[in-house]
């Protein structure tokens, strides 16, 4: 079958790093500079991706594989193959159209990317708040009040969390 296929289509014999050159009677030609083919049987070589601006080169292009980019410090990758770079924010913030904004009260973000998420509602699991939440950290839920027999623990439910110095935007 392989022999039959190659007789029908000489291009199928062209390995990665080459292309089937119609200008040369369909013989395999190596990819020209700054281009690649990652699979055999290609009729063209693809132009290497260039990592410019906010992108930086993670892996150089070769004749058989494309370049791979990541983002310069202060940015992180988004999309398949790092097709975009998005600005980092601090923990406790999220990126909006107007830039990085602090998480609203009752929400947190423990990463430099992504959105602020609501604190866990301990009471939904019948538990109590053991450690208050902050802009950067979720609350820590403790045992339910019913689990605490009198005198078994000195833990008292904390007062509702307030964030010092957090005024409306």
């Amino acid at each position: 079958f392989e022999r039959t296929r190659s007789l029908q289509d000489p291009c199928s014999n062209c390995p990665a790093g080459t292309f089937c050159d119609n200008n040369r009677n369909q013989i395999c030609s190596p990819c020209p500079p700054n281009s690649f083919s990652s699979a055999g049987g290609q009729r063209t070589c693809d132009i290497c991706r260039q990592c410019k601006g906010v992108f930086r080169t993670r892996k150089e292009c070769s004749s058989t594989s494309n370049a791979e980019c990541d983002c310069t410090p202060g940015f992180h990758c988004l999309g398949a193959g790092c097709s975009m770079c998005e600005q980092d924010c601090k923990q406790g913030q999220e990126l909006t159209k107007k830039g990085c904004k602090d998480c609203c009260f009752g929400t947190f973000n423990d990463q430099k990317r992504g959105i602020c998420r609501p604190w866990t509602n301990c009471s939904l699991d019948g538990k109590s708040v053991l450690v208050n939440g902050t802009k950067e950290r979720d609350v820590v839920c403790g045992p339910s009040p019913a689990d605490l027999s009198p005198g078994a623990s000195s833990v008292t439910p904390p007062a509702p969390a307030r964030e010092p110095g957090h005024s409306p935007q």
Epitope: G17, P30, C31, P32, P33, N34, E60, C61, S62, S63, T64
Partner: nanobody, 111 residues
């Protein structure tokens, strides 16, 4: 004008070795790939070995483990060391760089 001139071909017995050379005139190594092709009578010209633009050597399946391509940029010369030659390696061998071709050198493997 750029010229590629091959040498080193000849008659050799099966299992023997030959070293082909391809000398270039003109500054082409910095911008082009270096490749060796071969063409047996009545057959299509086929790519045997090449040094890609990223300076990595590649080989056709028929050449792997037996042939070695190398390049000396100071001498503007590309080499093809051919070991363990077989009857089916008999062909005219052509040097190529970009759009430029040599005139070919004949390799005949015969007992």
């Amino acid at each position: 004008a750029v010229q590629l001139v091959e040498s080193g071909g000849g008659l050799v017995q099966p299992g023997g070795s030959l070293r082909l050379s391809c000398a270039a005139s003109g500054n082409i190594f910095s911008i082009h790939v270096s490749a060796w092709y071969r063409q047996a009578p009545g057959k299509q010209r086929e790519l045997v070995a090449w040094i890609a633009w990223d300076n990595v050597a590649h080989y056709a399946d028929s050449a792997k483990g037996r042939f070695t391509i190398s390049r000396d940029n100071t001498k503007k010369t590309t080499y093809l060391q051919m070991n363990s030659l077989k009857l089916e390696d008999t062909a005219a061998y052509y040097c190529n760089s970009g759009d430029f071709w040599g005139q070919g050198t004949q390799v005949t493997v015969s007992s």
